[in-house]
């Protein structure tokens, strides 16, 4: 007996209050189906009901979290129904407050190296889920370590490749309610660096400026980079600008830093729009120093 295929659109991780579409596809082309939920709290809107093509479920509540299967209409079967489909686990987020997600030693990871993603919370979560944006497979399930101040998990990811780079979020859950998840952590962009040759970084009017003077950092390369990223040592985040083709055949971006008050070591990276989390080697560091200011960090 042909089993139908059950899928969830846009995915199986759904924010509380949002909608999710459950689609049941029969290889025999029958478009009527029934839905059942195997665990957790009952969902009355599924009972004694025949759906056509797909079902828009929502606004979802914690009660909707659980494992679903569908059976499609099957006129040649004794019961009139197919065998049950594959299971689809719907996880509902926003039930607990969000955990925090960090990368050690940092979110910029050299190609081939390993990064540790640490998800932690002051809530005692026995389970954590790690989810990468744009991936339809189930999130990675991790066992949390409980301690007096809450819980955490460390996940070692590597060797680093563009396939592992992306935007990550983590969620927490408790054992007795495994499909009711916390709100997502703030997103963390994991970037693989060292995939292309390094760009050049220079300063106009120069790397030593008076306090309050304007300085512009120019990042350039003969590679056809679409975007340049400028980062300052010991600072999270980066400035991002689109590259412009110059007359001399280089691709360049100018970062106006405005009136500077303190200096620091700057680096820039190049990347392509099609692979936003895959960057070049860093430029050589450019120390910018500010005179007439004691805070030359």
């Amino acid at each position: 007996q042909d089993k139908p295929f059950l899928s969830a659109w846009p995915g199986t991780v759904v924010s509380e209050g949002q909608h999710v579409t459950l689609q049941c596809r029969s290889r025999l082309g029958f478009n009527e189906f029934s839905l059942s939920k195997e665990d957790g709290m009952p969902v009355p809107e599924l009972y004694n009901r025949i759906f056509r093509n797909s079902f828009l479920m929502g606004p979802v509540t914690p009660a909707h979290a659980g494992t679903y299967r569908c059976c499609s209409s099957h006129p040649h079967s004794p019961t009139g129904w197919s065998a049950p489909s594959n299971p689809v686990v719907i996880m509902v987020t926003g039930v607990h407050r969000k955990p925090s997600l960090l990368a050690h030693p940092g979110p910029l990871v050299k190609s081939g190296e390993t990064v540790i993603l640490q998800c932690w919370s002051d809530v005692r979560f026995e389970r954590f889920l790690l989810h990468r944006e744009g991936i339809t497979e189930d999130p990675l399930r991790l066992v949390g370590q409980l301690h007096d101040a809450g819980s955490q998990v460390n996940y070692s990811m590597g060797p680093m490749t563009p396939a592992l780079a992306g935007t990550y979020r983590c969620f927490g859950s408790v054992t007795h309610l495994p499909y009711e998840l916390s709100a997502p952590s703030d997103p963390l962009d994991i970037v693989v660096v060292g995939l292309y040759g390094k760009p050049s970084l220079s300063a106009q009017p120069g790397p030593t400026v008076q306090a309050g003077e304007n300085v512009t950092l120019s990042c350039s390369s003969r590679s056809l980079f679409d975007i340049y990223h400028l980062s300052r040592e010991a600072e999270a985040g980066e400035l991002r600008l689109t590259a412009v083709l110059r007359v001399n055949g280089t691709f360049q971006a100018n970062f106006p830093l405005g009136p500077v008050t303190h200096g620091g070591n700057y680096r820039c990276f190049g990347s392509f729009r099609a692979l936003p989390h895959a960057w070049s080697d860093p430029s050589d560091p450019l120390p910018v120093s500010v005179t007439g200011n004691s805070r030359n960090l």
Partner: antibody
Amino acid sequence: QVQLQQSGAELVRPGTSVKVSCKASGYAFNNYLIEWVKQRPGQGLEWIGVINPGSGGTNDNEKFRGKATLTADTSSSTAYMQLTSLTSDDSAVYFCARGNYYGTRDWYFDVWGAGTTVTVSS
Amino acid sequence: QIVLTQSPAIMSASLGARVTMTCTASSSVSSSSLHWYQQKPGSSPKLWIYSISSLASGVPARFSGSGSGTSYSLTISSLEAEDAATYYCHQYHRSPPTFGGGTKLEIK
């Protein structure tokens, strides 16, 4: 600006069907739900059902099951509601509305069509 | 399903009066999941107040909304002639979404 333009009034015979259309403009059709609401003369508002144009997924009020079929054509940004086996109880104004999401659990209908009057009479 | 009961069904008040109408839910509605619509004869409903107390675009500041749990209200601080209409409360906290029976507001 954001608009939902509904098809014109219909006078139909009992037992027949009618298809009401709702053409969206001024926003990304796939990014919002389209809701359908019934209002009988001098009466209140009754939710019929909802369609997500992006996925084709639908949900409906048990009361209208087997009566209303909701579809959407993303190429023309148009939602449709077909009503079958019409009786005098189906004589009403039918509205489409955009289902919008705000904050944490806050769905409301922020833009409404002008309504389509369906009269069922022999 | 969540049943919304509006009271009074019909009310009349003088221009300049303070007017309050209520909406009671049969079970608790999540905070900020209750909305109000205004409808005038021959027209479609208009979103009037969303998420309990936020005024929709173009709605005069004399309107306000409040409430929590199962009890909600819409208040007009000083009634004007253009406020004559039927007002519906609405919840979409649980499927199916439901509307109250409406309060018809008339000018004395």
